[in-house]
Interface confidence: low
């Protein structure tokens, strides 16, 4: 018969013909002949392959390195890698997250509309009026201007993005 | 091994721009913040600002807002420092930093390039 | 900005001694995640700065143990165990957790 020119899924074309793909978490010893199956072996501590393939070196870990602000978020197995997440205070800086940086602070006269996460850095806004924020911060909001009204005082210093209002007590004397 | 290696001395004229260059090697140049710091003859050392490659975010000291732009060539792993309008106190030892990241600090040095202003 | 005040100016060192160089901030360097962004770099003579100690207590990589950094918020020492003659330089503290990022003036360690 012809040589086959395309294979099976799983299989892969080598001399003429057709031979198994290793199983994710396995590589490849030796290839199929007419009469032998194509040999596998289990990829070993620390190493992994995550697809069906011919390859004939496991792949490593991926080592989160703590110099990186790195650390482990899902250990590997020999079929999947280790998955990479940044300390605390600290964000990847790209997808593949192979390192990270420092989540930025809002600084006073903002507030934090989002928190940061291990993926993602610090969203800042401005204070709205009415807000302030005289902390730089990752982590605090804008607070509303305190209401003197309710504690029956009256404004003596208004209040801007970075300073709260300043209450006072209410002028007694009548006309 | 990590190296930076920075653009020859420069003399410049009061009001002209410079263009400094630093060339990185040994590392994965977008995984880095570069930071530029300068000395003048005889001081110590003040930090103008740094770049972040994979983003092109850019960080600068207000005191050289609008004169000075950071710039980088991710496709042969240079970092630009720009500074215009110059005067006589621009002139400086500009060194090139790589930023260590979970450091936070300035790990590797480029060699640095005088820059000389002068009428 | 956020000021760096290193003492003394001067250091003159004997071989084999001790050596210890302070150096205060004006803010607390410390970030809420429980790090202090305070490192010391070393210039030696017709050098570039080298990295020393980062986050107030941590040797870069290739640095002797004989140099250990301390302190805590606004007040911070690099302390040299035995004083070497290869050791003679300028030495800056500085902080990169407010930007921006400053220095202190230096002190010049030089032998006796």
């Known amino acids: 018969p012809e040589p086959p020119t395309a294979c099976r899924e799983k299989q892969y074309l080598i001399n003429s013909q057709c031979c198994s793909l290793c199983q994710p978490g396995q590589k490849l010893v030796s290839d199929c002949t007419e009469f032998t199956e194509t040999e596998c072996l289990p990829c070993g501590e620390s190493e992994f392959l995550d697809t069906w393939n011919r390859e004939t070196h496991c792949h490593q870990h991926k080592y989160c390195d703590p110099n990186l602000g790195l650390r482990v978020q899902q250990k590997g197995t020999s079929e999947t890698d280790t998955i990479c997440t940044c300390e605390e205070g600290w964000h990847c800086t790209s997808e593949a997250c192979e390192s990270c940086v420092l989540h930025r602070s809002c600084s006073p006269g903002f507030g934090v509309k989002q928190i940061a996460t291990g993926v993602s850095d610090t969203i800042c806004e401005p204070c709205p009026v009415g807000f302030f924020s005289n902390v730089s911060s990752a982590f605090e909001k804008c607070h509303p201007w305190t209401s003197c009204e309710t504690k029956d005082l009256v404004v003596q210093q208004a209040g801007t993005n970075k300073t709260d209002v300043v209450c006072g007590p209410q002028d007694r004397l009548r006309a | 091994q990590v190296q930076l290696v920075q653009s020859g001395a420069e003399v410049k004229k009061p009001g002209a721009s410079v263009k400094v260059s630093c060339k990185a090697s040994?590392?994965?140049?977008?995984?880095?913040?570069m930071n530029w710091v300068r000395q003048a003859p005889g001081q110590g050392l003040e930090w103008m600002g740094n770049?972040?490659?994979?983003?092109?975010?850019?960080n600068y000291n207000q005191k050289f807002k609008g004169r000075v732009t950071m710039t980088t060539d991710t496709s042969t792993s240079t970092a630009y420092m720009e500074l215009r309008s110059l005067r006589s106190d621009d002139t400086a030892v500009y060194y090139c930093?790589?930023?260590?990241?979970?450091?936070?600090?300035?790990?590797?040095w480029g060699q640095g390039t005088t820059v000389t202003v002068s009428s | 900005d956020i000021v760096m005040t290193q003492t003394p100016l001067s250091l003159p060192v004997t071989p084999g001694e001790p050596a210890s160089i302070s150096c205060r901030s004006s803010?607390?360097?410390?970030?809420?995640?429980?790090?202090?962004?305070l490192h010391w770099y070393l210039q030696k003579p017709g050098q570039s700065p080298q990295l020393l100690i980062y986050?107030?207590?941590n040797r870069f990589f290739g640095v002797p143990d004989r140099f250990s950094g301390s302190g805590s918020g606004t007040d911070f020492t690099l302390k040299i165990s035995r004083v070497e003659a290869e050791d003679v330089g300028v030495y800056y503290c500085?902080?990169?957790?407010?930007?921006?990022?400053?220095f202190g003036g230096g002190t010049k360690v030089e032998i006796k």
């Open positions: 803010q607390s360097l410390v970030h809420s995640n429980g790090n202090t962004y």
């Open positions: 770049i972040d490659p994979y983003y092109g975010n850019t």
């Open positions: 500085s902080q990169s957790i407010h930007v921006p990022w400053t």
């Open positions: 986050k107030l207590t």
């Open positions: 930093a790589r930023l260590g990241l979970q450091l936070y600090a300035l790990d590797y």
């Open positions: 040994g590392y994965t140049f977008t995984g880095y913040n």
